[in-house]
Structure formats: C-alpha cells, structure tokens
Amino acid sequence: MNGRVDYLVTEEEINLTRGPSGLGFNIVGGTDQQYVSNDSGIYVSRIKENGAAALDGRLQEGDKILSVNGQDLKNLLHQDAVDLFRNAGYAVSLRVQHRLQVQNGPIGHRGEGDPSG
C-alpha cells in the first residue's frame, strides 16, 4: 500500500550579504503570476551556482519568501517583488517558509487530529 505524502512546514530567518553578482536566485509568483493555485506568494525557483544564496546554503528552490527586510511580500505584483529584492541593499534579511515532503504511513491510517485531504 502506498504511503500518503504530507508536508512539514518550517520558517527560518536567513540573512544574506549581497555578493558581486547579487543575491543569486530567481523568483516566481505574485498577484499577476500565481505559481501555486490560490496563492499569490513569492517562491524561489532557482538558486544560482556560486551565488550568495548558494554559498550560504539555507535558501532552497521551492521555498516561499514571506518577507524581505521585514517587508511583507503578500499581495504584490511580480515585478514589484523583483524590484523589492533589487533595492533591498547590501545586507538582506529573508523570512522564508520551507516545505519538506514527508512520507506519512499507509493510506487509511490517518492520525488523530490530522488534517484531512
């Protein structure tokens, strides 16, 4: 019997120092470019090799970025979010949400209090 896939969601504060070629990652998402259905959040789509984010090692492709230097990224147009990163200065603080896929036992053995669906 196949196991059910669940997700463990954690948050982390990541402080990056802008390198010679910038922060070194790509984003997708925004109110005009929803990457996840019914979610206009901003997601990391690419970590560039040898960039600041890659060298730090904590930011991962697929992470959702909740805020930049304390500024919430909710309900932003995609380009406005891009501009926010580009104008964020030398020291950049990111609040990110990691979503780790976990195998959670056989189907039909849902733990008590487990969210359905």
Partner: nanobody, 128 residues
Framework: QVQLVESGGGLVQAGGSLRLSCAAS????????MGWFRQRPGKERDVVAT????????YYLDSVKGRFTISRDNAKNTVFLQMNSLKPEDTAVYYC??????????????????????WGQGTQVTVS
C-alpha cells in the same frame, strides 16, 4: 535536484523526422525553463531551442528555424523537440537541459541566457 531522461533519438534518412522527448523529475516541472542543446562531432555544445517556464517564450538556433519545434506538456513533466526535414549536419548528441525559471532578483545584466543547471545524458541523432 532535477533528473532528466531523453529518448527518441536514432538513425534517420535526410528529409526525415524525429521527435525527442525529455522527462523531468525531482521538482515541480512547471517552474522550469527547458532547453535542447546538441554537440556535433568535434564541436562545442550549442543551444538548439529553449522554452521558458510559462511556455510563452521560445528561442531557436537560426539553422533549425522552421524545421524544429520545441514544446512542453506540464501534465506529463515532459519537453519535446519535433525535428522535421532533417539534414546530415543535424547529426549530433542531443541534450535536454533545465533550470529554474522566473525572474532574477539581481540586475538583468546578470542573466546568462543559455546557462542551465541540470543536464540529461544525451541521445544520439544520426542523419544519413
């Protein structure tokens, strides 16, 4: 990590057609820019065609325009290269490549158009 597996290569006569496929796994396909590259005998690896993550922007090498078509099927996690009117000079190992799409948070000058992060093993195409 992204795993890429190409298929569809083979031996074909000049003027014939082949359809290459590249199946991707390891992360959501819908956020990936995809590309096809080729390495001809004794030559550097060249970009042949690319398609961005949303599917609304494509690029073709001049010598394949009008003959080759790149497309993607996000439901099947697959990118295709339809090759028509093949010529002997199309003989090469064809590689599928992928990278995360979207916008760089850095200045646009930093974008390297044909820099890809993940590569398949390649499939041989021989046109006789």
């Amino acid at each position: 990590q992204v795993q890429l597996v190409e298929s569809g290569g083979g031996l074909v006569q000049a003027g014939g057609s082949l359809r290459l496929s590249c199946a991707a796994s390891g992360r959501p396909f819908s956020s990936l820019d995809m590309g096809w590259f080729r390495q001809r005998p004794g030559k550097e690896r060249d970009v042949v065609a690319t398609i961005n993550w949303t599917g609304d922007s494509t690029y073709y090498l001049d010598s394949v325009k009008g003959r080759f078509t790149i497309s993607r099927d996000n439901a099947k996690n697959t990118v295709f290269l339809q090759m028509n009117s093949l010529k002997p000079e199309d003989t090469a190992v064809y590689y599928c490549a992928a990278r995360g799409g979207g916008s760089s948070v850095d200045s646009e000058y930093d974008v390297r158009e044909f820099e890809y992060d993940y590569w398949g093993q390649g499939t041989q195409v021989t046109v006789s």
